[in-house]
């Protein structure tokens, strides 16, 4: 476990021409705040993918009002560090997104308004416990200067915060096979604890809580032998051996949850629901009471009345989980409609809407036809965030700019012949038929069939004949 720390040094216009306009004005004073999002690895991930390593939001900076006529200076910044705690190992390589947000403090209807001023992103290698790394990133005409570092929280040490240190039990040396903890020479490395139940013969770990299998073994605890029978399994050959993996058990098969925990499958893996008094990924941490301080992030521990309720954590706003170990990402409530992008700003949820949609939750389909003209007498029909034109006769295409063959749809009934005409089309009817589309038979006595109902309709039905 540890903390990633980010220190913003300055945010202001970058060098070169085209200095940006100040984001604040006398009419609209504003202040800045920052959001950092961390993801493990060096993958080029979309801005909206989850901040799997964590995220943090800064405090608000001082209120700033532009001096008329002055160029945008470096803007006043919030005090303090942005801190992103991580519970597991520090990955060493990570991706970051730092967003600069503006809070407008004018007379907004419904309170202050937020807007994204700049977003920078990057991919870096960083060892925990190292010195501050300095960086400069540009976003358009803006420049952001910042430093960052990752540090381990005791008792963890090392470049990945995976080695654990304990005070020496004897003053002279550490136990068998355990090294002193540099730079804390008066402490010793604690033995590595693999995932509970990890097979001692067929499994091993390089980080606490993991269980990696030796060749020929599989399963979450390395207790399942890899089948060496002929490859009939739909899974195909295993890369680890010449044999095949037996068809994969479901993530809850064999119930990986210890201590009476119940397993439920999730799209990506499984989740253990632990009885009170147990916690951990597989309910493997046991016998916990409030005296053990099981509630993270300032959660309030309340002792239960019976053994099944050894404790319960009442989480502060912003945290959830049996032990308040998870940061609440309120975007997981899926509040944004019509493909809007959700931003949990800590104090509020914001939806960034796709083109054609608006509203706090992107629920309003904008008038797609506003400002859109359909040529040649076409009429605009809106829907689904995109406009389309219903074209007048003789025209087609997205905006009715293309000439269409009006006779292509064979509009003349009863063998009538169609002629394209500048005003549309003309039907030359076969003998015995009449009407704009040759739709009406002519009576033998020469009278038109117009007053009578077409076949299949009773006289008096409210049909209009054209």
């Amino acid at each position: 476990a540890g903390v990633f720390e980010l220190q913003i040094h300055s945010f202001g216009p970058g060098p070169g021409p085209g200095a940006p306009r100040s984001p604040c004005s006398a009419r609209l004073p504003c202040r800045l705040f920052f959001r950092v999002c961390l993801k493990p690895g060096l993958s080029e991930e979309a801005a909206e993918s989850p901040c799997a390593l964590g995220a943090a939001l800064s405090a608000r900076g001082p209120v700033y009002t532009e001096q008329p006529g002055a160029p945008a200076p470096d803007l006043p910044l919030p005090d303090g560090l942005l801190q992103v705690p991580f519970r597991d190992a520090w990955p060493g390589t990570f991706s970051f997104i730092i967003e600069t947000w503006r809070e407008e403090l004018g007379d907004q209807i419904g309170g202050p308004a937020w807007s994204l001023l700049a977003r920078v992103a990057g991919r870096r290698r960083l060892a925990a416990g190292g010195p501050w790394a300095r960086d400069i990133q540009r976003a358009g005409a803006w420049e952001l200067r910042f430093s960052y570092r990752a540090r381990c929280e005791p008792p963890a040490v090392g470049t990945a915060c995976t080695r654990l240190c304990r005070p020496r039990s004897a003053p002279s040396r550490c136990g068998p096979g355990l090294r002193p903890c540099a730079p804390l020479e008066d402490e010793c490395e604690a033995p590595l604890v693999c995932r509970a139940g990890c097979s001692p013969e067929h499994g091993f770990c390089e980080q606490p809580g993991e269980c990696r299998c030796l060749e020929g073994w599989t399963g979450p605890l390395c207790t399942v032998p890899v089948s060496t029978s002929s490859c009939l399994s739909p899974r195909g050959p295993s890369s680890a051996t010449t044999g095949c993996l037996v068809p994969g058990p479901g993530p809850c098969d064999g119930n990986p949850c210890a201590n009476g925990g119940s397993c439920s499958e999730t799209p990506r893996s499984f989740e253990c629901t632990c009885p009170r008094g147990f916690y951990g990924l597989r309910c493997e941490v046991s016998g916990v009471t409030c005296a053990d301080g099981p509630c993270f992030n300032g959660g309030l521990c309340v002792g239960g009345a019976d053994p099944d309720s050894a404790y319960i954590c009442h989480c502060p706003p912003g945290f959830q989980g049996s032990n308040c170990e998870k940061r609440v990402d309120r975007c997981s409530l899926q509040p944004c409609r019509n493909g809007g992008l959700c931003l949990d700003l800590g104090h509020a949820l914001r939806c960034r809407c796709r083109a054609g949609f608006a509203g706090p939750r992107c629920e309003h389909d904008l008038d797609d036809c506003a400002g859109r003209a359909c040529a040649n007498g076409g009429t605009c029909v809106e829907g689904g965030g995109a406009h389309r034109c219903s074209c007048a006769l003789g025209f087609g295409g997205r905006d009715c700019r293309e000439r269409a063959d009006p006779c292509a749809a064979r509009p003349c009934a009863h063998g009538g012949r169609c002629y394209a005409h500048f005003s549309g089309l003309v039907c030359a009817c076969a003998p015995g038929y009449m009407g704009a589309r040759c739709e009406f038979p002519v009576h033998p006595d020469g009278a038109s069939a117009l007053p009578a109902a077409p076949p299949g309709l009773r006289p008096g039905d409210p049909q209009r004949y054209l």
């Epitope: 989850p50 419904g110 309170g111 999730t266 799209p267 990506r268 989740e271 706003p317 959830q320 609440v328 309120r330 997981s332 409530l333 899926q334 509040p335 944004c336 409609r337 509020a348 939806c351 706090p360 939750r361 629920e363």
Partner: antibody, heavy 117, light 107 residues
């Protein structure tokens, strides 16, 4: 039209497990989170938490941590509520409800769970 | 947690009456205040969301208002089908919380 159809009533003994289903239709299931609400006999409504239908990640209110589990079968547009180690105080009607970004706009008809020895 | 209080647990009114049901929050919050109707058969429906917006298909005799900590639901012309229990709910801060409910009966 939008519908949430829940499984039928359940009669269970203390210590047993129950799993209630909520089948959604009339909309894209993975676009809206699903929420669960408890109503004890003669009492008001109590929000239990939600599950993100895109990722499967649940969130539980404090009183529903431990024995309660939300899960999904996305291919069947179905959400589940599982209650383990049932107690008498779990006797209630449980509702699933869709969240539209403002409020819980459509609700299931409710599933009655009775726990009695 | 934000506590929601509906001081009137039951209310009698005559058909055609204008009925107002109130709800108070323990702390100031934004307008994510919603009203639900639970019929005697147990079915629950959303009536009003975001303080004053009418959910689709809900008759226009229902309206909502309020801000800060005090909110109300008004039925302008009571009909027989409005016999139900009405709950307010805040959706601003987790955990979401409901009022205790107001049961509406006909005199």
């Amino acid at each position: 039209q939008i519908q949430l159809v829940q499984s039928g009533p359940e009669l269970k003994k203390p210590g047993e497990t129950v799993k209630i289903s909520c089948k959604a239709s009339g909309y894209t299931f993975t676009d809206y989170s699903m929420h669960w609400v408890k109503q004890a006999p003669g009492k008001g409504l109590k929000w239990m938490g939600w599950i993100n239908t895109e990722t499967g990640e649940p969130g539980y209110a404090d009183d529903f941590k431990g024995r309660f589990a939300f899960s999904l079968e996305t291919s069947a547009s179905t959400a589940y509520l599982q209650i383990n180690n049932l107690k008498n105080e779990d006797t209630a009607t449980y509702f699933c409800a869709r969240y539209d970004g403002y409020a819980m706009d459509y609700w299931g008809q409710g599933t009655s769970v009775t726990v009695s020895s | 947690d934000i506590q929601m209080t509906q001081t009137t647990s039951s209310l009698s009114a005559s058909l055609g009456d204008r009925v107002t049901i109130s709800c108070r929050a323990s702390q100031d919050h934004s307008n994510y205040l919603h009203w639900y109707q639970q019929k005697p058969d147990g079915t629950v429906k959303l009536l009003i969301y975001y303080t004053s917006r009418l959910h689709s298909g809900v008759p226009s005799r229902f309206s909502g208002s309020g801000s800060g900590t005090d909110y109300s639901l008004t039925i302008s012309n009571l009909e027989l089908e409005d016999i139900a229990t009405y709950f307010c709910q805040q959706g601003d801060m987790l955990p979401w919380t409901f009022g205790g409910g107001t049961k509406l009966e006909i005199k």
